[in-house]
């Protein structure tokens, strides 16, 4: 069951597995969740009673029976991990620590404005997990202003200590506020000859690839293939880092993979969400439990449901056998990860999904879509919402997508004639426009945030976001769509669809059903020669058919370009403007939404 | 509640600078821009220029090479200069702000006369 | 810059009995966004001007609906179904598409 509420002045006696130090016991329960194995923890707050050397220690506890007794302690605040919840996780954390001095490698010192800059700094910097910022009041003259970048093999500090006049935060990587480049690509044939921080058994290069991203101290990793010719090292990922932040020596080496960490993708893509079946894979760990099931899916939802398993191997009935059923061996080990993996034995392996609620919303994978036509079907595109004003009268006004779970992004110009947000209304999981009813549910708009440099949608910086009065509960017809990366700025994406109940021709009106099409992405020079009048900028992309015929049109503004890469959807563009609808050699020209993800992620963000 | 009040001469003699103030409350001017138009008597409305939310400026390009538009965010004050004043640029000044965007132009000052004579 | 030409430039109407005013502009104003940036304002004698009418129809709140916009392209009208005693003035159309922003040169509405 999940418990999120701490309990002040109790201990858990027993089943620690480490202790670590963090500012906070909030911040102990996200460290507690992120743990392969802590359901349960104990923090010890800074009190008078207690020893200061065990104030601010956070211990990690495990238990078979999931509760530990409880035993009272002035000082001590205890709960349990998030791991039995079924909400978003995020391990972002923006707070401030005033007076405390968390201790790490100090291996980077600089002058610095503020404490923001400071924080900055820590997460545009590859090795940085947390900082310790001098402010100007602090005694010693020569260390005031400065900026003290840390890490640690954790990633948490080594030891906190109360300091006057210091203030200390950790990197904002996982709130996906770095700059730091991307790099989806897996190279094949290529080992990374560098330092070797920690080794784990992995299935394949994605797994080892997201589990480097979750690592702390991993930048890049190498894997050995199944068919590497070591067996000792067959399906042996090596988390590796260096001081460069780049691997210094790349040896090519059939059969062996390498790549980086994900950390400056995480927004975007799951990294810790393992949900491939591995066949002829056998995962070996601690035995949790042996249950029958029906599945190697059925098996794998035994596992998620469990809440200390970790990952399992299902070897299915042999005819006739228990009611067809097979057995479902659900696992754990230290680390998460198998301790061995076997191939040849018949068996089917995988993880639990309980991980993935730790993952963005926006990359769990939706239905399949249907191919062809024109008119959507239900949960096709659970991020598009309609946007209706209520004034003069109730219509259609625009599409927007969601993109959290109280933001809808769409298009400034959809925003003339609106004198308030109260005069708007967001309906999500919407096909047909007929499904709107006076006393269908619909969100409420708090605030409409709208770029301080749009002044037409020609001129670039059609981009709004819609604050919502209530939380959107995310199902299979109303989820979020990713933003797309920084990093991936390069991507060439050639799935892409434009959707909306815009018009269908020039002279027409909002279509009932929820229009799709297929659109090719069209190079700015090739835009730009097609619109000679205007200036097309980086902060715009295009698409459409050189012969026209598809397009989006009045009505679908605001609404998304969304393009599927790597088996995510990410929200590529907004529908802005173009000159008239699938008119030839006219493509439509969207907002370039990778250009304003730290617009948008500010505005979100802000405290 | 949201008020644009203009303020400046009353008179002005040919040839001198115009400088119009517009003091604006209930909302910021980094969130919206503002117009000035103006309305010589029994004469239609002329709209002379913008200051948008980012600072940037569009003109009348009969009247752009006398004009200036500004503001000062922090005092709540858009500005307007009209150089190389004229008897013909007699008018009321008025100036107004949009709803979320630019235009439609939903609150208006009251206006200031001013008059261009020796 | 575009034009934006108002006919008539009076008119006088008998209460209770309609009204129409044309604009037309030199240039077309609907915006590669799909918008139509035309709005009508009235100004009331010693009043500040007050809107009307946006994007072509949309009646702006509180405004009675014997007020209605119609057109496209070039050519844009505002009716008055039934014209009462308030609603003398005179009457602008506005563009805001293309910078610069132009008012038509307005029509005085009288009662008979």
């Known amino acids: 069951e999940c418990v999120t509420q701490l309990l002040k002045d109790t201990c858990f006696e027993g089943g620690d597995i480490t202790t670590v130090f963090t500012p906070s016991a909030k911040y102990c329960q996200v460290v507690c969740t992120y743990h392969p194995r802590c359901l349960l923890f104990t923090f010890t707050a800074e009190s008078p009673s207690e020893d200061p050397t065990r104030w601010f220690t956070c211990v990690l506890k495990d238990s078979v029976t999931e509760t530990l007794p409880r035993v009272n302690r002035t000082a001590a605040i205890s709960g349990y991990s998030f791991k039995q919840c079924s909400h978003q996780i995020s391990a972002c954390n923006k707070d401030i620590y005033v007076d405390l001095d968390m201790k790490g490698i100090n291996y980077n010192s600089s002058v610095a404005k503020s404490a923001q800059e400071c924080q900055e700094r820590c997460t545009d910097d590859v090795h940085c997990h947390f900082f310790t910022y001098a402010t100007r009041q602090f005694p010693s003259l020569e260390h005031r202003n400065i900026c003290l970048l840390k890490h640690t093999q954790t990633g948490t500090p080594t030891r906190i200590t109360k300091l006057d006049k210091v203030v200390s935060g950790f990197s904002l990587k996982s709130c996906a506020l770095s700059n730091l480049a991307c790099i989806r690509d897996i190279f094949p044939n290529t080992v990374f000859a560098d330092s070797n921080i920690d080794s784990v058994m992995a299935p394949d290069a994605f797994v080892c690839g997201r589990i480097c991203t979750h690592h702390p101290g991993c930048l890049f990793f190498t894997f050995f293939s199944q068919e590497w010719p070591k067996e000792s090292q067959r399906n042996l990922c090596l988390l590796k880092t260096s001081e460069s932040g780049l691997p210094s020596t790349r040896i090519k080496k059939s059969k062996a993979l390498s790549g980086f960490s994900l950390q400056s993708c995480r927004h975007s893509i799951p990294v810790f969400c393992h949900s491939s079946f591995y066949h002829d894979t056998d995962f070996l760990g601690e035995e949790l439990d042996i249950v029958a099931a029906k599945s190697h899916e059925a098996c794998q939802k035994l596992c998620t449901n469990a809440v200390r398993c970790q990952f399992f191997t299902y070897t299915p009935a042999q005819a006739s056998c228990n009611e067809g059923k097979g057995k479902c061996y659900l696992k754990l080990s230290s680390n998460g990860s198998p301790t061995k993996i076997l191939h040849g034995r018949g068996g089917i392996s995988g993880y639990t999904l309980r991980l993935c609620k730790m993952d963005n919303e926006c990359t769990t994978k939706i239905k399949p879509r249907i191919v062809g036509g024109t008119a959507s079907v239900r949960g096709e595109w659970p991020w598009q919402v309609t946007l209706h004003t209520t004034s003069p009268t109730q219509r259609h006004l625009c599409g927007g997508s969601i993109i959290g779970n109280q933001w809808i992004l769409t298009a400034a110009h959809c925003f003339y004639g609106v004198e308030s947000p109260k005069i708007l209304r967001v309906y999500s999981g919407i096909l047909n426009q007929s499904e709107i009813k006076e006393d269908t549910s619909f969100f409420g708009v708090q605030e409409i945030i709208i770029h301080d440099q749009y002044k037409m949608a020609e001129s670039g910086y059609d981009i709004a976001l819609l604050k919502l009065e209530t939380t959107v509960n995310y199902t299979d017809s109303q989820r979020p769509i990713c933003l797309p990366s920084k990093g991936d700025r390069n991507v060439i994406y050639t799935d892409c669809w434009v959707t909306g109940w815009g018009y269908r021709k020039l002279r027409d009106k909002i279509q009932n059903t929820l229009q799709k099409a297929k659109i090719p992405l069209v190079t700015n020079e090739e835009c730009q020669k097609r619109y000679r009048g205007h200036k097309i900028t980086h902060k715009m992309i295009c698409a459409g058919y050189r012969e026209g015929g598809k397009d989006a049109c009045k009505g679908d503004s605001g609404g998304p370009l969304s393009c599927k890469h790597n088996e995510v959807w990410h929200l590529v563009g907004i529908t802005s403007w173009g000159e008239g609808c699938a008119q030839r050699e006219r493509p439509g020209v969207y907002t370039n939404v990778v250009e304003y993800v730290d617009w948008i992620l500010e505005k979100t963000q802000a405290v | 509640q949201v008020t644009l009040k203009e303020s400046g001469p009353v008179l002005v003699k040919p040839t001198e600078t115009l400088t119009l103030t517009c003091t604006v409350s209930?909302?910021?001017?980094?969130?919206?821009?503002v117009a000035w138009i103006r309305q010589p008597p029994g004469k239609a409305l002329e709209w002379l220029a913008e200051i948008w939310r980012d600072g940037d400026t569009s003109y009348n390009s009969r009247l752009k090479s006398r004009l200036t538009i500004s503001k000062d965010t922090s005092k709540s004050q858009v500005v307007l200069t009209m150089t190389n004043m004229d008897p013909v640029d007699t008018a009321t000044y008025y100036c107004?702000?949009?709803?979320?965007?630019?235009?439609?132009?939903?609150?208006w000052g009251q206006g200031t006369l001013v008059t261009v004579s020796s | 810059d575009i034009v934006m030409t108002q006919t008539p430039l009076s008119l006088s109407v008998t209460p209770g009995q309609p009204a129409s005013i044309s604009c037309r502009s030199s240039q077309s104003l609907e915006s590669s966004d799909g918008n139509t940036y035309l709005e009508w304002y009235l100004q009331k004698p010693g009043q500040s001007p007050q809107l009307l009418i946006y994007?072509?129809?949309n009646r702006f709140s509180g405004v009675p609906d014997r007020f209605s916009g119609s057109g496209s392209g070039t050519d844009f009208t505002l009716k008055i179904s039934r014209v009462e005693a308030e609603d003398v003035g005179v009457y602008y159309c506005?563009?805001?598409?293309?910078?610069?922003?132009?008012f038509g040169q307005g029509t005085k509405l009288e009662i008979k």
């Open positions: 209930g909302f910021s001017l980094s969130s919206y821009s």
């Open positions: 506005f563009q805001a598409t293309r910078d610069p922003f132009t």
């Open positions: 107004a702000r949009g709803m979320t965007l630019a235009t439609p132009f939903l609150y």
């Open positions: 994007g072509v129809s």
